[in-house]
Interface confidence: low
């Protein structure tokens, strides 16, 4: 018979390799049974996690698996580093393995972006 | 110029579903989303959903389970399906052009709305 | 969902008069990440489809009158019509993008 606890499937040690200025959508794999959980996501800041309360988050509910996404829109230099969710299910804290992300700044902060990537890609003018 | 034009059935019966075209000029489908916002007769703005350049959709938690969102790149044109209507549905819907990110964006160009009543 | 909510749901001024009217979010709308308020403000005229004239709080769109003023931060918000002109004649509605789009009620501008 299959479990009936929450399991959160973040592959220890995963990374991301993104870039300053795109959109972002990091995942935390969440199975559960009849009631979803509570959900968040924190940033590792040495041995705490700092909880990120003011981001936009979302759920995308599949057939056999839900994911609980914390967005980056758009990411910026100091999102690098790494992050954990966690679940609140019937008094029990589950925690996952942590994920890095690694950003790379494209661009110095005093370089605007070219009109052609304005136009392909607006969400680097915020707006 | 940018430009955004809405075409419906104007009357559908009740547990139907409603189809309505969005032509688009003036910018690409592929760069840019469009959002649906509906206003029934009389009361205020209710945002319904978006198709983003990438193909992507949002909706409202509302009509989540009722509504599709999809589009032709090629023909400039974003469809709305709403099934299973109800007399509450009536409304001028509106299409409109978003600027920016899937959160942080604005409806920059509106089309001039398309009116649909449910009625037997 | 954001809950957005508009005050006063009506108000009547004359030509040349200041109006401001409010517009409270159920939670924050300031990005810690990006320092903006994720929060607009449309204009509807009678007849008339939505027009943006505020996005981020207080930055206006292109081509809208320097009388009408954003402010505000957080959960409440503010627009500022500086000189009410016979076209202000609207319905304004404010919007939140925090998180997936909500309007407000709308405030009915009517001239005296």
């Known amino acids: 018979k299959e479990s009936c606890d929450v399991q959160l499937y973040i592959k220890r040690q995963s990374e991301h390799s993104i870039l300053a200025g795109d959109p972002f959508e990091l995942e935390c794999p969440v199975k559960y049974c009849a009631n979803r959980p509570h959900v968040t996501w924190c940033k590792l800041n040495g041995t705490t996690c700092v909880k990120l309360e003011d981001r936009q988050t979302s759920w995308k509910e599949e057939k056999n698996i839900s994911f609980f996404i914390l967005h980056f829109e758009p990411v910026l230099p100091n999102d690098n580093g790494s992050y954990r969710c966690s679940a609140n299910f019937q008094s029990n804290l589950i925690e996952s393995h942590s994920t890095t992300l690694y950003v790379t700044d494209v661009k110095s902060a005093s370089e605007r972006p070219s009109k052609d990537e304005m136009a392909s890609r607006p969400w680097l003018l915020y707006r | 110029q940018v430009q955004l034009r809405e075409s419906g059935p104007g009357l559908v019966a009740p547990s139907q579903s409603l189809s309505i075209t969005c032509t688009v000029s003036?910018?690409?489908?592929?760069?840019?989303?469009v959002s649906w916002v509906r206003q029934p007769p009389g009361k205020g703005l209710e945002w319904l959903g978006v198709?983003?350049?990438?193909?992507?959709?949002n909706y409202h938690s509302v009509v989540i389970s009722r509504l599709t969102i999809n589009k032709d790149n090629s023909k400039s044109q974003v469809f709305l399906k709403l099934n299973s209507l109800q007399t509450d549905d009536t409304a001028t819907y509106y299409c409109?052009?978003?600027?920016?990110?899937?959160?942080?964006?604005?409806?920059?160009?509106w089309g001039q709305g398309t009116s649909v009543t449910v009625s037997s | 969902d954001i809950v957005m909510s508009q005050s006063p749901s009506s108000l009547a001024v004359s030509i040349g008069e200041q109006v401001t009217m409010s517009c409270k979010s159920s939670q924050s709308l300031l990005s810690s990440r990006t320092r903006k308020n994720y929060l607009a403000w449309y204009q509807q005229r009678p007849g008339q489809s939505p027009k943006l004239l505020i996005y981020?709080?207080?930055t206006r769109e292109s081509g809208v009158p320097d009388r009408f003023t954003g402010s505000g931060s957080g959960t409440d918000f503010t627009l500022t019509i500086s000189s009410v002109q016979a076209e202000d004649l609207a319905v304004y509605y404010c919007k939140q993008s925090y998180n997936l789009p909500t309007f407000g009620g709308g405030t009915r501008l009517e001239i005296k």
């Open positions: 003036g910018f690409s489908l592929n760069t840019y989303g």
């Open positions: 981020w709080a207080s």
């Open positions: 409109a052009k978003c600027y920016g990110s899937r959160f942080d964006y604005a409806m920059d160009y």
């Open positions: 198709v983003w350049g990438d193909g992507n959709t």
